[in-house]
């Protein structure tokens, strides 16, 4: 009996430009003889419903149809037919199929590969054209993929134990696509500093599929208006 097992859940997520390993494990009732077996990896893009060959291994012959693609013959002996793709790009997302032939048996498995790019975030203070005691804080998130992103503003006063989400005076602009396929977006918070307590901490909180935990940039309102003490907490996919 020949069986192939891919990533549990059927989806793998990898950061842009990473050297990704797409998992494929072979289970066979007898020891594997790599000279009499074949491995072929196929890729089907998200945009075109056409499957193309990425890598092929047959006995003493192997060929990469995608530059740098490799299946380790040494690992193959122990049943690991995982495909390594260096420098993965956004457009290489899609369905990958691992096909194994141990004559006369054939088995295959598929996995969805998602390529993500983590946002960078920065906080800016824009006082141009603002009234006295009124400030506009801009939270810029850039270089992220996919497009779906959630930007919220929170404040934490001295007395209350938990943050409070701010919904008023927040405007989040449209996402803008960059030349490399990633996206940028800016969210603005308008504050009347004379109505706020000194010591209140404001945060721009960015949530994205590429982040294990939100990306936060904060500033503290001081008696002398504000101190833009930006602190960023990044925890990218690894």
């Amino acid at each position: 009996d020949l069986k192939v097992e891919m990533m549990a859940g059927g989806t793998q997520i990898t950061p842009l430009n990473d050297n990704v390993t797409i998992f494929c494990n072979i289970f066979y009732s007898q020891p594997l003889n790599i000279t009499s077996m074949g491995i072929t990896w196929f890729w089907k893009s998200l945009t075109f419903d056409k499957e193309v060959k990425v890598f092929e291994f047959f006995g003493d012959h192997q060929e990469a149809f995608r530059p740098g693609a490799i299946v380790s013959p040494w690992r193959l002996k122990s049943g690991d037919a995982s495909l390594r793709l260096p420098g993965i790009q956004l457009e290489e997302a899609g369905e990958y199929r691992c096909e194994v032939v141990v004559t006369p048996l054939k088995a295959q498995g598929t996995v969805q590969l998602e390529v993500v790019a983590s946002p960078a975030s920065r906080l800016l203070l824009d006082q141009v054209g603002m009234k006295e005691n009124e400030d506009k804080y801009m939270c810029e998130s850039s270089g992220f993929y996919p497009e779906a992103i959630n930007i919220t503003w929170e404040k934490q006063t001295q007395k209350f134990p938990h943050p409070i989400e701010i919904s008023e005076d927040v405007i989040t602009g449209p996402t803008i696509k960059n030349m490399d396929g990633t996206f940028n977006v800016t969210s603005c918070l308008k504050l009347n500093s004379s109505q706020e307590d000194p010591g209140t901490v404001y945060q721009c909180v960015v949530r994205h599929a590429s982040l294990h935990t939100p990306l936060r940039s904060n500033f503290t309102l001081t008696a002398a208006r504000h101190s833009l003490s930006e602190t960023e907490k990044t925890d990218n996919f690894s």
Epitope: E154, Q156, T157, Q158, K159, F160, P161, H162, P163, I164, E165, G199, T213, P214, R216, K233
Partner: antibody, heavy 117, light 107 residues
């Protein structure tokens, strides 16, 4: 990192007073407000009151007014909560708590006060 | 004072189960609700703030929802370490008030 270390367990007689301390470290002490919570054995949580750590402001739950006094010693970064005229229903674990960060609010380890004759 | 009525008061469940705890406020508290987990002999640990936002480090199996007066905490797939007591708390105004707690036990 932020740490709130409370004084040890106390056993008191009815009518006596007790002063529980909470020593803070790992942050600029006077910038914060400290809350105190009560948890009677097997019961839920009750907010007793709070104090601004520069010492200029307190806020007590009506239920505990006359029972509790909160003070601050900024030189040692310590907050105190004194409970007076103790009765058996004051037997509880008392916690000091401070507003949090990304990981939630901070709590002391708790101080068990037992009122028993 | 704002009353927070939590239900059920106790609950038996098995590892892998989906569990929902509810909390009802006596008046509109917006989204100013937090959820805590407490294990015996330990201080409470905050899980959720603003009704639905998970604190960093809290597993994704914990989720909160609701606004106004009705709130829920859901654990999508119970793990052995989740057996504890859970409290809701309103923080829209002083005095801060808590629900009476829900004790989650192993079936």
């Amino acid at each position: 990192q932020v740490q709130l270390v409370q004084s040890g367990a106390e056993v008191k007689k009815p009518g006596a007073s007790v002063k529980v301390s909470c020593k803070a470290s790992g942050y600029t002490f006077t910038n914060y407000w400290m809350n105190w919570m009560k948890q009677a054995p097997g019961q839920g949580l009750e907010w007793i009151g709070g104090i601004y750590l520069n010492g200029d402001s307190t806020d007590y739950n009506e239920k505990f007014k006359g029972k509790v006094t909160m003070t601050v010693d900024t030189s040692t970064s310590t907050v105190y909560m004194e409970l007076s005229s103790l009765r058996s229903e004051d037997t509880a674990v008392y916690y000091c708590t401070r507003r949090g960060d990304y990981f939630g609010d901070f709590w002391g380890q708790g101080t068990l006060v037992t009122v028993s004759s | 004072d704002i009353q927070m009525t939590q239900s059920p008061s106790s609950l038996s469940a098995s590892v892998g189960d989906r569990v929902t705890i509810t909390c009802k406020a006596s008046q509109n508290v917006g989204k100013y609700v937090a959820w805590y987990q407490q294990k015996p002999g330990k201080a409470p640990k905050s899980l959720i703030y603003s009704a639905s936002n998970r604190y960093d480090g809290v597993p994704s199996r914990f989720s909160g929802s609701g606004s106004g007066t009705d709130f829920t905490l859901t654990i999508s797939s119970l793990q052995p370490e989740d057996f504890a007591t859970y409290f809701c708390q309103q923080y829209i105004s002083y005095p801060l008030t808590f629900g009476a707690g829900t004790k989650l036990e192993i079936k």
